[in-house]
Each structure stands twice: as C-alpha cells, then as structure tokens.
C-alpha cells in the first residue's frame, strides 16, 4: 500500500489548527491510529501524543481511489507554552506500518506573535494575534 502523512496548519481568528492528514486507500484505513506529538524526538507514540484518531474503514465510500483522513488539534490561543517541535505520525501494529511526518515548529515571539515553520513552503505560516491574519 502507498500510504503517506502530511502536516498543515490553519488559523481561525485566535485559534490555530494543527492538522495531520493521512492519505490511504479505503481498505488500508482499518487498524491505523494517527497521532500528533510535541517535543518527542524519539518516542512519539499514541500513548505520548497530544491527540490521537483511530481510522475506520468507511463502508459508504465507493471505489478504490485514494482518500484522506484528518486529525485536527486546535489551540484556542497560542501562548509561549505552545512553542516547540511537533510531529504527525501514524501507525498500524496490525500491519507493522509506521509513518512519521516531518517535524514542524511553533515559535512564540516576544512581540506576542508566533510563527509556524517546517511545513511545506505553501504551508509556511506566520500569525499575528493582534491582527488575526496570516502574514
């Protein structure tokens, strides 16, 4: 199976959404757990994660094309405590498959703004609490 994981982020007002997306075929979903870790360079696991999502095969989806499943972790107001290195991961003990996304970081600046780095270039985001916009 060709399964991969990507990381992205989006802003809604003061809220920051960290999104882990797993691309897979319908029949590959069962047995997978997707999870998001913070500051876990070597031992990112569902047990040490901020949030986890168990994938289920959706009988309502027809065809064998690639589909995506998303885990979303929402930070209602980014603070210095949220600074750190994050990683999206997925794993299936049933199949012995482990997917580890690229590390990305949240950096809270002294001016009260924060940046998210390490995502794909088009997903390299800079946020300002004051203006509530992407910059």
């Amino acid at each position: 199976g060709c399964i991969n994981i990507t990381s992205s982020a989006s802003q809604e007002g003061t809220r920051l959404n960290l999104i882990c997306t797993v691309w897979h075929k319908k029949e590959e979903a069962e047995g997978f757990v997707v999870f998001l870790c913070k500051d876990r360079s070597g031992d990112c696991s569902p047990e040490t994660s901020l949030k986890q999502l168990r994938l289920k095969r959706d009988p309502g989806i027809d065809g064998v094309g690639e589909i995506s499943s998303q885990l979303m972790f929402t930070i209602s107001q980014v603070t210095p405590l949220h600074s750190g290195t994050y990683q999206c991961c997925a794993r299936s003990q049933k199949s012995g498959i482990r997917l580890q996304g690229h590390f990305f970081s949240i950096l809270f600046t002294e001016t009260g703004n924060y940046t998210v780095t390490g995502l794909k270039q088009r997903q390299h985001l800079e946020f300002s609490h004051n203006e509530g916009t992407l910059s």
């Epitope: 199976g1 060709c2 069962e30 047995g31 047990e47 168990r54 299936s92 003990q93 049933k94 199949s95 012995g96 498959i97 482990r98 997917l99 580890q100």
Partner: antibody, heavy 112, light 107 residues
Amino acid sequence: QVNLQESGPGLVQPSETLSLTCTVSGFSLTNYGINWFRQPPGKGLEWMGTIWNDGGTDYNSALKSRLSISRDTSKSQVFLKMNSLQTEDTAIYFCARGMDAWGQGASVTVSS
Amino acid sequence: DIQMTQSPASLSASLGETVSIECLASEDIYNNLAWYQQKPGKSPQLLIYYANSLQDGVPSRFSGSGSGTQYSLKINSLQSEDVATYFCQQYNNYPFTFGSGTKLELK
C-alpha cells in the same frame, strides 16, 4: 500471495549466538513491518521485537541486551540475531508481517 | 509489563454450541487487543484485532467485544475446525504480551 519463511540452525550450543532469517514474498519490507515471536514447547507466545517498514526497531526490554533485528530489503529478508543463548531459549521462532500473516516457524533447540 | 489473564485454561463444548473466552488486562489497554487461533503444529492466525474488528477471511461466527481491561472472544455455532488453542494479545504497551491460552476441545 503473502508468504513468510523462517530459516536457521535447528540446534545451537549454550552461550552461542542464534541467527535466523525470515524471507518474505508477496509484499515489500518497505511497506510492511516484521515482528518476531517465539513459543517454548507446550507454552505460550512471547513477542521479541519489531522492525518497522521504515527500518526502525523496537525490542522486548527483557531481551533487548542480546537481541538485534535487521533487514535487507533488496533480498526481502529480515534477520534476527540473539546472543548468549541458554536452554530456556529453546522454542519455535516465528516471523510475522505485523500481526496478520505468520511464517510456519523455525524450531530451535539450545543444547550441548 | 501488562499482564494478560486468560480464562478458562481449557474448554470442552459440543458442535453448534456458543463458547466464550475471557481476557483480563492488568491495566486499561484501550481496545488494543488481538485474538489468535493456533492449531497443533501450526502458526497462530489472527482472528480479531482492535478488540472487535474481524480479520479478512475469518468466519463471522467469531466475534470480539470488551473495553478497558476486560475482553472476550465468542464463537457462535461451534464447528469441528474450531478445535484449537486461542490466545489474546495486548499491543497497547511495549512489550506486547499474550494470555496463557485457552485449549478448546469437542465434547
């Protein structure tokens, strides 16, 4: 069709090193991980360790100091090496694709 | 390590009967439990994973249930080919651990 086949010596001397090979077909080791399990005669199952699809490994802490799992993806083979064998290591050793497809097992006796 | 206590150790049942095997984990394993069937001289076969998901190709007379620390395997309408030893396994925490097995025989 998914197939796994364990191979290695049937008899190992105490204090020697056990080397087993798991040869797989019907899938790629870069897409699936392999677990090693063992089962002493007439007893239950013990998980030994995992080599993931990305080549990373996890080991049973009780065996970690003398166990090593590696692979050669081009030959579709996974290798188990365990040193300082004792009679209590006598068992049938299984490799499995994750949890869902198992080899038939390789019988290993530790005896002088 | 998580201890898996499986009961009964052995079980005798008649064809067509429904049988249940229990597995108790020493701590919450969050449904990360598998059931295997092993026939004499053969390797284990995965029946159930994630406590209640039926592995492809396994007859629907097998079912799994439970949560937290208590899990069970049920076999409806027992068939002669179901004579085997059954093991539970937790895969929530390293090291993965197994129950001691239940030997199922025909009356």
